[in-house]
Interface confidence: low
């Protein structure tokens, strides 16, 4: 018994929250709350936006965004996509691991042009030490952060 | 691998399915099938639609539930709130964990006015013995209860 | 130390991407790539699209598949449905074990009739030893594959 | 800034085929349809269809069925109208625009001329 | 089929408000769009979804609808308005696009 739950205490785990300081606008990945409220890091490392690997294997990783503006303006892009990316020192490019795409300003109601929607990502992916995971949005304008429970990301390892 | 067998049997998990009772009305959170057909507990409790820790550690957490209607009432929010929130004696007021805002309704499409959609929350979050995790919809009659398999609501340590 | 990493090692996974092949036409269930990119067996095999459980015990299943299309053809059913199901030699026919109904064409925005949506499901279930899980849409017509980080399917041993 | 520019004009004889491009700068071609709308001197505007670059989908008005084939060279981000069996009656400006059922941006028209 | 009306024309005195109509069997359950066309030029988009104004449209430029009628109203009418006005929606499917007759708007 307490071979297992020393086991538990050493898997590396991280759930990592939104925050008003996620959301950049300068191209780069979303940023994430490492320590307050609900976030942690346990056998995991952080760096600008990126969960690195301390310990080579599979990984669980995921991500929820929350989604959301006031009708579809027709400068807007109708097509939103969310992902999870790896970056690793093999490539020079972040390498696409989970993606999806979505088209929510479409989902506002008759009697009402608010809208929101949500995507969450999941998947198992290896990860060498050193290896980064990271999240983009695009278009990241239509993130709606709040209290660190509607976008989030996180991995445990498997 | 006796030693790793032991310790994969013993780590808590349960998924817990949606049934006719799931829906209250009385404002409380849903409530959950725990032993009939896919559902069970291995080293966790159920109480009142709640899953009770029995252990402390990191929990990865999920619930999906399945959304219909016909046409957006305008009576009906437009916005619906699916979440995932904790009990603690440490606390009066239940915590937020994961939650999602959608806008379902105004899925109708131009020649049907019945919609189907579907939330998806996951994410880990640490548990101390006695914490309690239960899933709220609101407006939860929009829920769509079938067979256990649209609307679920489960956790694993990790 | 040893002991851990051997358990890990050993735990059973598997991530299958989406390829060309895996949309059939015919009924069945979507097939997958196991080896290619991200895609990995480990402790688990594959056949015919399906996951074959190669240990006993609970398992965390999972599947995302991107829907997309153009417009909403009066001809196509408005219901997209995404569901993990169970093939065990105890049963003639298969066993659903999460599933998702959505409503997807109504997404399409005002100027630009291409809409996009994604499904996630996720869920413990249990399988005994030769017991598979597949995936199934109805109307698989509106999956769009890419490269496999779109429309996947995977497993742990929870 | 979004800009479609059509080619230039022609004059065709009747029983013959004219071919009309529509060349899409300014925003990712394959994200939006091209509709072609024709107008005739004097007259009101008649939608003709619509194709989806990205994925080729196509549909047209009823009357065109059978005459008209709408396609497209992503490679350039061209969109290109069809139109078969030519009549007087088809003496029109022909348009393109950009868009679902929000038709945003329009070409400056392309005048096709039928006959004999 | 289908279809889309419209009065043939309109005329206002400078400064006065134009309203054009276009009533339609299905409108209470489509959106309506507004073109405005000069002599010799391509249609522009000035009211799309019913009531919505793309950027650079004059905000005199207004839309409603409400049943079977959709309305463009033009507050405060200028000479430079002077156009053919057509709306337009789409049918049952949201596949094909109906125009309206068009308008003709005079402004004195």
């Known amino acids: 018994l307490i071979q297992e739950r020393r086991s538990h205490q050493n898997n590396p785990a991280a759930h990592l929250t939104g925050a008003n300081s996620s959301l950049t606008g300068s191209g780069g990945p979303l940023l994430w709350e490492t320590q307050l409220g609900l976030a942690f890091l346990r056998g995991l490392d952080y760096h600008d936006g990126a969960l690195v690997a301390n310990k080579a294997g599979y990984y669980y990783i995921y991500s929820k965004v929350q989604l959301g503006g006031v009708g579809c303006p027709l400068g807007l892009a109708s097509t939103i996509t969310h992902g999870l990316y790896k970056r690793t020192p093999r490539y020079p490019e972040e390498l696409e691991l989970l993606v999806s795409q979505q088209s929510p300003c479409g989902r506002a109601t008759s009697n009402s042009r608010v809208w929101w929607d949500s995507s969450f990502l999941g998947g198992v992916v290896h990860l060498e030490v050193g290896e980064e995971v990271v999240v983009r949005v695009l278009d990241e304008r239509l993130v709606r952060l709040r209290d660190g429970t509607r976008s989030y990301f996180g991995a445990f390892m498997v | 691998l006796i030693q790793e067998r032991r310790s994969h049997q013993n780590n808590p998990a349960a998924h817990l399915t949606g049934a006719n009772s799931s829906l209250t009305g009385s404002g409380g959170p849903l409530l959950w099938e725990t032993q009939l057909g896919l559902a069970f507990l291995r080293g966790l409790d159920y109480h009142d639609g709640a899953l009770v820790a029995n252990k402390a550690g990191y929990y990865y957490i999920y619930s999906k539930v399945q959304l219909g209607g016909v046409g957006c009432p305008l009576g009906l929010a437009s916005t619906i709130t699916h979440g995932l929130y904790k009990r603690t004696p440490r606390y009066p007021e239940e915590l937020e964990l994961l939650v999602s805002q959608q806008s379902p309704c105004g899925r109708a499409t131009s020649n049907s006015r019945v919609w189907w959609d579907s939330s998806f929350l996951g994410g880990v979050v640490h548990l101390e013995v006695g914490e309690e995790v239960v899933v709220r919809v609101l407006d939860e009659r929009l829920v769509r209860l079938r067979d256990g398999t649209r609307s679920y609501f489960g956790a694993f340590m990790v | 130390l040893i002991q851990e990493r051997r358990s890990h090692q050993n735990n059973p996974a598997a991530h299958l991407t989406g390829a060309n092949s895996s949309l059939t036409g015919s009924g069945g269930p979507l097939l997958w790539e196991t080896q290619l990119g991200l895609a990995f067996l480990r402790g688990l095999d594959y056949h015919d699209g399906a996951l074959v459980a190669n240990k006993a015990g609970y398992y965390y299943i999972y599947s995302k598949v991107q829907l997309g299309g153009v417009g909403c053809p009066l001809g196509l059913a408005s219901t997209i449905t995404h569901g993990l199901y169970k093939r065990t030699p105890r049963y003639p026919e298969e066993l659903e074990l999460l599933v998702s109904q959505q409503s997807p064409c109504g997404r399409a925005t005002s100027n630009s009739r291409v809409w996009w949506d994604s499904s996630f499901l996720g869920g413990v279930v249990h399988l005994e030893v030769g017991e598979e899980v597949v995936v199934r849409v109805l109307d698989e017509r509106l999956v769009r594959l890419r490269d496999g980080t779109r429309s996947y399917f995977g497993a742990f041993m929870v | 800034q979004v800009l479609l520019v059509q080619s230039g004009a022609e004059v065709k004889k009747p029983g013959a085929s004219v071919k009309v491009s529509c060349k899409a700068s300014?925003?990712?071609?394959?994200?939006?349809?091209i509709n072609w709308v024709r107008q005739a001197t004097g007259q009101g505007l008649e939608w003709m269809g619509w194709?989806?670059?990205?994925?080729?989908?196509?549909d047209y008005a009823q009357e065109f069925q059978g005459r008209v084939t709408m396609t497209r060279d992503t490679s350039i981000s061209t969109a290109y109208m069809e139109l078969s069996s030519l009549r007087s009656e088809d003496t029109a400006v022909y348009y393109c625009?950009?868009?679902?059922?929000?038709?945003?941006?329009w070409g400056q028209g392309t005048l096709v001329t039928v006959s004999s | 089929s289908y279809e889309l009306t419209q009065p043939p024309s309109v005329s206002v005195s400078p400064g006065q408000t134009a309203r054009i109509t276009c009533s339609g069997d299905?409108?209470?359950?489509?959106?309506a769009y507004w073109y405005q066309q000069k002599s010799g030029q391509a249609p522009v988009l000035v009211i799309y979804?019913?009531?919505k104004r793309p950027s650079g449209i004059p905000e005199r430029f207004s839309g409603s609808s409400s049943g079977t009628m959709a309305t463009l109203t033009i507050s405060g009418a200028q000479v430079e308005d002077e156009a053919d006005y057509y709306c337009?929606?789409?049918?049952?499917?949201?596949?094909?696009?109906?125009f309206g007759g068009g308008t003709k708007l005079t402004v004195l």
């Open positions: 979804e019913d009531s």
């Open positions: 194709m989806n670059p990205d994925s080729d989908n196509t």
């Open positions: 337009y929606s789409t049918d049952s499917s949201d596949n094909h696009v109906i």
């Open positions: 300014g925003y990712t071609f394959t994200h939006f349809d």
């Open positions: 625009a950009r868009g679902g059922t929000t038709l945003d941006y």
């Open positions: 299905a409108l209470p359950k489509k959106y």
